[in-house]
Amino acid sequence: RTTTCFGDGCQNTASRCKNGGTWDGLKCQCPNLYYGELCEEVVSSIDIGPPETISAQMELTVTVTSVKFTEELKNHSSQEFQEFKQTFTEQMNIVYSGIPEYVGVNITKLRLGSVVVEHDVLLRTKYTPEYKTVLDNATEVVKEKITKVTTQQIMINDICSDMMCFNTTGTQVQNITVTQYDPEEDCRKMAKEYGDYFVVEYRDQKPYCISPCEPGFSVSKNCNLGKCQMSLSGPQCLCVTTETHWYSGETCNQGTQKSLVYGHHHHHH
């Protein structure tokens, strides 16, 4: 946020940019957390926009029995590897077709033992506060489906009738990695020394990192006619004085009519 300065006072302003603000010849360029002519004000909301999607990766091993291992399968650029990859990918796309979070598979290694396929199953979901549950559920369904297909699609008399056949006992889930996204942690970090006073509130399942000085949220501080300002000791209401009233109190809700005060003073005189 920037405020432009014109006239003689500008040089003076330059040396007074606060909170790490830098003078660009016209104005104070403020760091993310601050705004105002001198970067003296603390922002009331910080953009912690979550990623659009969250990913998970499952490391799996299956044993394919309907293809005999050859040395060429170790070479990822060989025609053998490419054909195997194509069939395996098509087969897995069928296996996981009912899982909306399924993105695809990535073969990491093929080794001897019929063909032992070390691969990653890739999952992705739209960010919502429940993304962990969504991906946990998806990984469970992946386990169920791969267990089922490797139990059902098996060789009979050294022949496979399916696109691929498997060894029932060769199916293992090695590891599951979910991209971590913690809006509360991000909010605290980005609010720096004001971290104790910024909170995450959700609107339309999107997280907002806000201080009580941001209007329209459940934690918002109502300063009435005053102005909410953040300081290191927390949010405070700066009360205004109008032509007719002085305002005071924690939330500037106590108005004193000037005429009454003046009248009172005159009365005392």
């Epitope: 025609q79 054909e83 496979c160 056949c165």
Partner: nanobody, 123 residues
């Protein structure tokens, strides 16, 4: 990339013989798997005879003892010798190949296909 060209189909009386051929170009013939599949009208494509570079062969029960699959590596050609033909052998015959050593009858596992040659057996 393997290209396959099937030929040799035709019409024959029941009990007769035919030999269909499949010429391969673009790759060596010595590795992987080769096969003959057929598709009868209104039916799914099915495996008839398969052969792999490790010596493994397969024949569908309905053709055992009547059909023989073979290959000539010097000519890069696959053959299917058919004797004692029956009306139910009437179909479009396709040759297929894969650089993988396969043990599957499922056409979806086979990557390269010829265009097909028609075999008609009348009673």
């Amino acid at each position: 990339e393997v290209q396959l060209q099937a030929s040799g189909g035709g019409s024959v009386q029941a009990g007769g013989s035919l030999r269909v051929s499949c010429a391969a170009s673009g790759d060596t013939f010595s590795r992987g798997s080769w096969g003959w599949f057929r598709q009868r009208p209104g039916k799914e494509r099915e495996a008839v005879a398969l052969i792999s570079s490790d010596g493994w062969t397969f024949y569908a029960d309905s053709v055992k003892g009547r059909f023989t699959i073979s290959q000539d590596n010097t000519k890069n050609t696959l053959y299917l010798q058919m004797i004692s033909l029956r009306p139910e052998d009437t179909a479009m015959y396709y040759c297929a190949a894969s650089v993988l050593v396969l043990r599957t009858l499922n056409p979806k596992a086979w990557h390269h296909w010829g265009q097909g040659t028609q075999v008609t057996v009348s009673s």
